[in-house]
């Protein structure tokens, strides 16, 4: 049978609350050189134990008996420190362990999770979490809203998760953890009620440099909306912004709207340009979330100025006219030019030149018509821009270059009949 155990003192028991400091002690009496004392917790050697070993000889000879005392210090007791503790020594070819001592944790509940501050949209459901542990178990939770208990007694209402169906005012929540030792109260979480995201952002009207937009406000609880903020950003040919992308790729145009009405005119925009817009509304508690980006586009406008540098020269029965693109903004895609010419006593002739910037006219009457003038206007899909001032046809002088151009015969009657909105009458003849 095994030799008698050398242990003459075994570890005691420690039970206390978190943070407690305590010491376990074991004592043995051995003959000869004292062994190193190891500590086990639940059968596992403690490699980084805060232990001290004291050795006292009972005689003058090294081979006499020794008293060995090992002390294990537990600082700031935690759940991971709990378990069964034993001392272990290797003596010769034998292994000895002490009787076990136990370290337990017992005190007020300890929070593993507490409710956190957060923002929620008005009348929108959300959850809060709270988790506590002993020992001793069980730990029962009691939720409080604005310091008012939400159940008749601990453990009777919601426990780890509190489901709140919605709030219409900013509120505070906390939870109490109850066990046999008493009560611990969690931190107080503030739940801030923000306006709901606006809905149905849409265009009311469009102008080349102006968009009128409207939206439906979301609920904001007991807090009236103070204003709404609209952002517009150039769509950059569809690059960069997707429907749900949180931040625009460049600095947006930001406008504030007093509310009501939930409508805003956005000015100073580029014509015929794609934009993305979004809106958020603000109460005294803060702003709602932004709506998704809505793609919109300003329509085309008519050119803002006439063609430039018009020159018109006449050589017998032919007239050569050329010009340059308007310097003023086109407000869209240039589709072409219209030309009108008229003599002193002859009807006005209107022509669509297309995108060319020059034309040679074949005049009737062998050039006998006097005081001939020419006007040119640029047009887009939105209509004609302003006509140029009338330019008189000058006689061609030898030495002037006159390139060969397609001849355009002057019709005996006006060749074109323009739809009313395309024909800008001019008053200079």
């Amino acid at each position: 049978q095994a030799e008698e155990s050398p242990f003459v003192g075994n570890p005691g028991n420690i039970t206390g609350a978190r943070g407690l400091t305590g010491t376990l002690r074991c004592q043995l009496q051995v003959q000869g050189e004292p062994p190193e004392v190891h500590w086990l917790r639940d059968g596992q050697i403690l490699e980084l134990a805060d232990s001290t070993q004291t050795q006292v000889p009972l005689g003058e000879d090294e081979q006499d008996d020794w008293i060995v005392v090992s002390q294990l210090r537990i600082t700031s007791l935690q759940l991971s420190d709990t378990g069964q503790y034993q001392c272990l020594v290797f003596l010769g070819h034998q292994t000895f362990v002490s009787q076990p001592g136990y370290v337990g944790l017992e005190g007020l509940p300890y929070f593993l999770e507490e409710p956190e501050d957060r923002t929620v949209a008005a009348n929108t459901p959300f959850n809060l979490s709270c988790q506590a542990q002993g020992p001793p178990e069980p730990v029962d939770l009691l939720w409080l809203q604005d310091a008012v208990p939400l159940a008749t007694a601990p453990g009777h209402g919601p426990q780890r998760s509190l489901h709140v169906p919605g709030l219409n005012k900013t509120s505070s929540f906390s939870c109490e953890a109850h066990n046999a030792k008493g009560v611990t109260t969690s931190r107080t979480a503030t739940i801030t009620v923000l306006p709901q995201q606006p809905r149905n952002l849409h265009l009311v009207s469009r102008q080349p440099t102006e968009l009128e937009v409207a939206w439906t406000p979301g609920l904001s609880g007991i807090y009236p909306l103070t204003h709404c903020t609209l952002q517009a950003v150039l769509s950059d040919d569809g690059m960069g912004i997707q429907a749900g992308e949180p931040d625009p790729p460049e600095e947006p145009l930001t406008s504030q709207a007093s509310v009501p009405p939930h409508q805003l005119r956005l000015g100073s925009l580029h014509p015929h340009t794609p934009y993305h817009i979004r809106v958020a509304c603000t109460s005294s508690q803060g702003p709602s979330s932004w709506t998704h980006w809505l793609p919109v586009e300003t329509p085309e406008g008519v050119p803002l100025g006439p063609p430039e540098n018009i020159s018109a020269t006449r050589n017998g029965s032919q007239a050569f006219v050329h010009w340059q693109e308007p310097r003023a903004p086109l407000q869209g895609t240039l589709l072409g030019y219209r030309l009108a010419y008229q003599g002193q006593d002859t009807p006005e002739v209107l022509m669509d030149i297309g995108l060319r910037q020059e034309v040679t006219l074949e005049l009737q009457g062998d050039g006998s018509v006097s005081n001939l003038t020419v006007c040119v206007a640029a047009y887009t899909a939105a209509g004609d821009g302003p006509w140029s001032l009338p330019v008189p046809l000058e006689a061609w002088r030898p030495g002037q270059a006159q390139p060969v151009h397609q001849l355009v015969k002057e019709p005996s009657t006006p060749a074109f009949s323009w739809p009313h909105h395309h024909h800008h009458h001019h008053h200079h003849h």
Epitope: Q1, A2, S5, H38, L40, D42, G43, Q44, I45, E47, L48, Q84, Q86, L88, T95, V97, Q99, P100
Partner: antibody, heavy 116, light 106 residues
Framework: QVQLVQSGAEVKKPGASVKVSCKAS????????INWVRQAPGQGLEWMGW????????KYNEKFKGRVTLTVDTSISTAYMELSRLRSDDTAVYYC?????????WGQGTLVTVSS | QIVLTQSPDFQSVTPKEKVTITCSAS?????MYWYQQKPDQSPKSLIY???NLASGVPSRFSGSGSGTDYTLTINSLEAEDAATYYC?????????FGQGTKLEIK
């Protein structure tokens, strides 16, 4: 001297349970942990859990939780390992081993074969 | 859990040679333990607390190491040392073993 003597080989059908015994001698049975370690054919060693005979406290490897039960009968210095819901991959040699922070003494092993 | 990786998996050695088996841990540990298992036998404790010889183990066996790298050394190998050697840690739960190193005598 320290000795751990295990029960004999077992053949079981899938879904059945097996209970292996380990009789200890040569040391104070209630002072030392008894561990169970298994070794599948041609494989390495896998710890299953321990029991402290002095208190009956147990600790299990998560892999086996719910299927393994460790017990002792201190009156006859015997530890038991029961494994339920056996599968073919539970075929292995099962060892009991005394521990003092490591496994200082081992039983001779019990072969458990699971086959339909 | 801590994974222990032994090297080599297999070694064929002649008697009187010096053999070194290494064991690498996936995270730092305080102590390493070594076991010897001969064919059709149960494992036997060889080294405990990294460098201490278990009862009855010949002095040609020794252990060393710290942190993540540990070594078992057999000086002047003998025929009876043909076996599979396992390293083991219990610095954290669960205790785990290396995959084993099989030593064959030429």
């Amino acid at each position: 001297q320290v000795q751990l003597v295990q029960s004999g080989a077992e053949v079981k059908k899938p879904g059945a349970s097996v209970k292996v015994s380990c009789k200890a001698s040569g040391y104070p049975f209630t002072d030392f942990y008894i561990n169970w370690v298994r070794q599948a054919p041609g494989q390495g060693l896998e710890w299953m859990g321990w029991i402290y005979p002095g208190s009956g406290n147990t600790k299990y490897n998560e892999k086996f939780k719910g299927r393994v039960t460790l017990t002792v009968d201190t009156s006859i210095s015997t530890a038991y390992m029961e494994l339920s819901r056996l599968r073919s991959d539970d075929t292995a040699v099962y060892y009991c081993a005394r521990s003092t922070g490591f496994f200082d003494y081992w039983g001779q092993g019990t072969l458990v074969t699971v086959s339909s | 859990q801590i994974v222990l990786t032994q090297s080599p998996d297999f070694q064929s050695v002649t008697p009187k040679e010096k053999v070194t088996i290494t064991c690498s841990a996936s995270s730092s540990i305080g102590y390493m333990y070594w076991y010897q298992q001969k064919p059709d036998q149960s494992p036997k404790s060889l080294i405990y607390l990294t460098s201490n010889l278990a009862s009855g183990v010949p002095s040609r066996f020794s252990g060393s190491g710290s942190g993540t790298d540990y070594t078992l050394t057999i000086n002047s190998l003998e025929a009876e040392d043909a076996a599979t050697y396992y390293c083991q840690q219990w610095s954290s739960n669960p205790p785990t073993f290396g995959q084993g190193t099989k030593l064959e005598i030429k």
